[in-house]
């Protein structure tokens, strides 16, 4: 008997005292458990377990399915076991055909033998096909055949357990290996839209797509900074063997302003985790916010082009847009387009293209936009810069020389006297009177300036130059003087454009 210290409990003894035993099919299995504190016999094979409270286990007519491990346990929880093979030439293998293997792990093809003395216990491919070259296995008559380090490529592999019995090869029922892939990367998560803008009462629905190699990937919708369980619905598909897709749809049937926030779709597997967020903004009503892309006060030179550009946020989407000038609506010369093609885009651009502007086309240009909730507008004040134009140049009855010029910005009029026939007038003459004639008139268009000098100051023949100029350009008019006796006469007044 096993040597044990006095008083120390020892395991039961089983008779016959063998680790393994062969019994022929149809013969009796008789096993005796000797122990003063005998409790029970248990029998295990594949997924089957039986118990017996008698100290002698008797199976009168042994069958192949009685092959297995018989364990005797005493009241101290100590046990001894014997493995019995019931040799049945007609049933060499006990088979549990379910065969799942986790990638990179070992898996057991459960085909224990009923006769351990057969030879060449191994695996074979179905229909004579060879096994994958890198497939390694370890046979164990009591358990089956262990496939080492299962590869993803073995998925759906058809196998038989095989052994040579009396010189003939015997095959078990077939097994189909189903490989559960190992997670070698984090799940791939994406969201239907990165942000949502809704009005109160509207439905919020967002879908997260989770992609991984198998359905055992975990996923959930979470609200940031909240533990509340969200209601989600799932749809899933297997696209081929190791391409699993799940769609998790989160819905709030009637969104409220306080539902605004960041929602996270979180997924994890044994490799790691991944997440993606979407932002929900719920507003009590729609809005339009306009942002001018250029200054709303615009100065442009006569004959040049200008583009009036606005960006605006509109939610819900804009329904009507128009550009107006002097109560007239532009039907062309403008375009309106979304800032991006993104589905959640709420930003738009509107451009009014003004070409070859005339001095008379200055004024207020207004952009108006509306949606189902609000209207908004923005005005541009357009000033057309024009080169001064000398409207009149006269000698008045009171002996004054008067020059009236129009332009924008307001022209400045300078006077010069040129003695004799010289055209180079350098001696400046101070005006007697300068007035801006339409300063209180309409705010756009040309400004008219009138300037006068006293001609009595001139004692010699010569030319007087009236020079009107601003930031855009200058124009001159000339007065020629000749003395006849004591009388001074204006002769040949003419203008000279000086760019």
């Amino acid at each position: 008997q096993p040597s044990v210290s006095p008083g120390e409990p020892s395991p039961p003894s089983i008779h016959p005292a063998k680790s393994e035993l062969i019994v022929r099919v149809g013969n009796e299995i008789r096993l005796l458990c000797i122990d003063p504190g005998f409790v029970k016999w248990t029998f295990e094979i594949l997924d089957e377990t039986n118990e017996n409270k008698q100290n002698e286990w008797i199976t009168e007519k042994a069958e192949a399915t009685n092959t297995g491990k018989y364990t005797c346990t005493n009241k101290h929880g100590l046990s001894s076991s014997i493995y019995v093979f019931v040799r049945d030439p007609a049933k060499l293998f006990l088979v549990d055909r379910s065969l799942y293997g986790k990638e990179d792990n070992d898996t057991l093809v459960r085909c224990p033998l009923t006769d351990p003395e057969v030879t060449s216990y191994s695996l074979k491919g179905c229909q004579g096909k060879p096994l994958p070259k890198d497939l390694r296995f370890v046979p164990d008559p009591k358990a089956g055949i262990t496939i080492k380090s299962v590869k993803r490529a073995y998925h759906r592999l058809c196998l038989h357990c095989s052994a040579d019995q009396e010189g003939k090869s015997v095959l078990s029922d077939k097994f189909i290996l189903k490989v559960r892939p190992a997670f070698k990367a984090v799940p791939v998560v994406s969201v239907s839209k990165a942000s949502y803008l809704l009005r109160e009462g509207e439905e919020f629905t967002v879908t997260c797509t989770i992609k991984d190699v198998s359905s055992s990937v975990y996923s959930t919708w979470k609200r940031e900074n909240s533990q509340t369980k969200l209601q989600e619905k799932y749809n899933s598909w297997h696209h081929g063997d190791f391409n699993y897709e799940r769609q998790a749809t989160l819905t709030i049937s009637s969104a409220r302003v306080n539902d605004s926030g960041v929602f996270m779709c979180y997924a994890n597997n044994t490799f790691g985790s991944a997440n993606v967020t979407t932002t929900l903004e719920v507003v009590d009503k729609g809005f339009i916010n306009i942002f001018p892309m250029i200054n709303t006060t615009v100065f442009v030179n006569d004959g040049e082009n200008v583009d009036l550009i606005v960006e605006y946020e509109a939610f819900p989407k804009p329904e009507h847009q128009q550009w107006i000038y002097m109560n007239r609506t532009f039907t062309d010369k403008w375009e309106d387009y979304p800032k991006s093609e993104n589905e959640s885009n709420i930003r738009y651009v509107s451009e009014l293209h003004l070409t070859r502007l005339k001095g008379t086309e200055g004024g207020t240009y207004t952009f108006l936009v509306s949606n189902s909730d609000v209207n908004a507008s923005i005005a541009f004040n357009v000033y057309v810069n024009t080169k001064p134009e000398i409207l009149t140049y006269d000698r008045l009855v009171n002996g004054m020389l008067q020059c009236v010029a129009a332009g924008f910005p307001e022209p400045t009029i300078d006077w010069y006297f040129c003695p004799g026939t010289e055209q180079r007038c350098s001696a400046s003459v101070l005006p007697v009177d300068v007035q801006t004639l339409n300063a209180s008139g309409p705010p756009f268009g040309k400004l008219v300036v009138q300037s006068s000098i006293d001609s009595s100051a001139f004692k010699h023949n010569g030319t007087v130059e009236c020079k009107a100029y601003n930031d855009v350009g200058k124009t001159s008019a000339y007065f020629n003087f000749a003395f006849k006796g004591n009388n001074k006469e204006q002769i040949h007044p003419h203008t000279l454009f000086t760019p």
Epitope: P2, N27, P116
Partner: antibody
Framework: EVQLVESGGGLVQPGGSLRLSCAAS????????MDWVRQAPGKGLEWVGR??????????EYAASVKGRFTISRDDSKNSLYLQMNSLKTEDTAVYYC????????????WGRGTLVTVSS | DIQMTQSPSSLSASVGDRVTITCRAS??????LNWYQQKPGKAPKLLIY???SLQSGVPSRFSGSGSGTDFTLTISSLQPEDFATYYC?????????FGGGTKVEIK
């Protein structure tokens, strides 16, 4: 060649001791459960005792007639089985056989030729 | 201990005879019974194990039967080399006891 060869027999006085050896060859000795069987001159076979292999935790069992006097041991590294006999009695005179058990049954499928132990004053 | 009783203790037979030897156990030993043949000055030789399984290399004229307490060894046609002593042995519970033996002699 698969064989068992006993040695160590001889004449010994009552109360004396003797150690028998059994050398195994041609098979994996460490896997086998091993027994000693004796046969007194002109008599039948009597089982003496056995030792299990490592899987059987090297457990030993003895016949009542020798229990406490005889000890069976083994040295797997030397492929050897031993029978230490103490307090020998005249009735222990016999041919002592070393025998092998097969893996899956208790029987004696291989025997040595035996060694004679004579206990006499 | 389990007692094994063999009968007859001896028998005389001629070459070609059918010979039957019986062995009875004092309690049920299922099929845990073995038969051995021993010739003078030689070690025993295993003939039958597990009551009815023929050991490799043993002629098929030897057969065994029985289960529980009663067992039989049959030699269907006695051959000159079969004259020997035959022993049964139970291998259910230690001590693994032998029967007293049956000596088969030439008539």
């Amino acid at each position: 060649e698969v064989q068992l060869v006993e040695s160590g027999g001889g004449l010994v006085q009552p109360g004396g001791s003797l150690r028998l050896s059994c050398a195994a060859s041609g098979f994996t000795f460490s896997d086998a459960d091993m027994d000693w069987v004796r046969q007194a001159p002109g008599k039948g076979l009597e089982w003496v005792g056995r030792t299990r292999n490592k899987a059987g935790s090297y457990t030993t069992e003895y016949a009542a007639s020798v229990k406490g006097r005889f000890t069976i041991s083994r040295d797997d590294s030397k492929n050897s089985l031993y029978l230490q006999m103490n307090s020998l009695k005249t009735e222990d005179t016999a041919v002592y056989y070393c025998a092998r058990e097969p893996k899956y049954w208790i029987d004696f499928d291989l025997w040595g030729r035996g060694t004679l132990v004579t206990v006499s004053s | 201990d389990i007692q094994m009783t063999q009968s007859p203790s001896s028998l005389s037979a001629s070459v070609g005879d059918r010979v039957t030897i019986t062995c009875r156990a004092s309690q049920s030993i299922s099929s845990y019974l073995n038969w051995y043949q021993q010739k003078p000055g030689k070690a025993p030789k295993l003939l039958i194990y597990a009551a009815s399984s023929l050991q490799s290399g043993v002629p098929s004229r030897f057969s065994g039967s029985g289960s529980g307490t009663d067992f039989t060894l049959t030699i269907s046609s006695l051959q000159p080399e079969d004259f020997a002593t035959y022993y049964c042995q139970q291998s259910y519970i230690a001590p693994y006891t032998f029967g007293g033996g049956t000596k088969v002699e030439i008539k």
